[in-house]
Amino acid sequence: AFGISGVQKYTRALHDSSITGISPITEYLASLSTYNDQSITFALEDESYEIYVEDLKKDEKKDKVLLSYYESQHPSNESGDGVDGKMLMVTLSPTKDFWLHANNKEHSVELHKCEKPLPDQAFFVLHNMHSNCVSFECKTDPGVFIGVKDNHLALIKVDSSENLCTENILFKLSET
């Protein structure tokens, strides 16, 4: 798993960054866990990063992710309800220069090294549909969320609002 110090070292550099001309409104480091309190961890294997969903041993350090929050204007002609709306979007970076990406073709969530401006696949619309949990909807594929499948992160299609509360797309953020 990544050491936390490496992430913290580069948060200051990110504060000065501009992604597609927009700066994040706020950033912070948090560990990511599932609704059932399994941890999201990241490991370097064969020169690429793997993402796991697992139970941590007692006193094992949780991996931290840098969440950068962006405000996105949604014009009224797109919103369908006659008002300009704002959404919160996030990018998630567990280590320097690597971001979570939605691979819509493979229905997978991957870590990619990339330079700014980040592609749309790295942006996720933030939902809090459940008390103190969040969900991440693909910017590039509305209705598709980051979810848990077979101890990995995957992209999961949510076909109705009733399923927005399904546990496998709910995540907890913790700064401890």
Partner: antibody
Framework: QVHLKESGPGLVAPSQSLSITCNVS????????VHWIRQTPGRGLDWLGV???????SYNSALMSRLSISEDISKSQVFLKMNDLQTDDSAIYFC???????????????WGQGTLVTVSA | DIQMTQSPASQSASLGESVTITCLAS??????LAWYRQQPGKSPQLLIY???RLADGVPSRFSGSGSGTKFSFKINNLQAEDFVIYYC?????????FGGGTRLEM
């Protein structure tokens, strides 16, 4: 134009229940959460609960056993029901809309005018 | 529940002056803090969200700062309509708690 308006009974007898309707216009309940808040001179502003975009509901745990929030999307209405009212439930009850689509992190951008509820025999 | 401690409870100031109100959260809330003002007989009005962002139509003499547990709200060049009550609110986790309010008096 975003608009929220509460309508309530005004006077409620102790141990009876309270029903308030929040009529909304200018936005979609499928995109924005609607919150219920009450205000008393003694306690200030108290958050009661939220009907989130997508229909899920969160309550203030201190009042959860007495509260029920629901909606009629076709009529653009959100409802608050509170049981077993006591005199200290006398307050101005507000509904308010989230600032952001799909999340409450940005606070409440639009509020109704409030409806005064007095609990008295 | 997260407690929000707002201070001072009341403050006197004069037209054209600046004032600062602080809000302390009992645990870290990131940047998820909003500031409202409430005129007598009216509902609260959102001024600042995400700790530092100015809500639509709010004059730039209002500003917010802070993150984590300590937040500040400043009004420059006080106008007559600013002498009302101000509230902070945390939106990090439910229940979304408010501060006790600050009454600004002339």
């Amino acid at each position: 134009q975003v608009h929220l308006k509460e309508s309530g009974p005004g006077l409620v007898a102790p141990s009876q229940s309270l029903s308030i309707t929040c009529n909304v216009s200018g936005f979609s309940l499928s995109k924005y959460g609607v919150h219920w808040i009450r205000q008393t001179p003694g306690r200030g502003l108290d958050w009661l609960g939220v009907l989130r975009a997508g229909g899920t509901i969160s309550y203030n745990s201190a009042l959860m056993s007495r509260l029920s929030i629901s909606e009629d999307i076709s009529k653009s209405q959100v409802f608050l029901k509170m049981n077993d009212l006591q005199t200290d439930d006398s307050a101005i009850y507000f509904c308010a809309r989230d600032h952001y689509y799909y999340s409450s992190f940005g606070g409440f951008a639009s509020w109704g005018q409030g409806t005064l509820v007095t609990v008295s025999a | 529940d997260i407690q929000m401690t707002q201070s001072p409870a009341s403050q006197s100031a004069s037209l054209g002056e600046s004032v600062t109100i602080t809000c302390l959260a009992s645990q870290t809330i990131g940047a998820w803090l909003a500031w409202y003002r409430q005129q007598p007989g009216k509902s609260p009005q959102l001024l600042i969200y995400a700790a530092t962002r100015l809500a639509d139509g709010v004059p730039s003499r209002f500003s917010g700062s802070g993150s984590g547990t300590k937040f500040s709200f400043k009004i420059n060049n006080l106008q007559a309509e600013d002498f009302v009550i101000y509230y902070c609110q945390q939106l990090n986790s439910t229940p979304y708690t408010f501060g006790g309010g600050t009454r600004l008096e002339m």
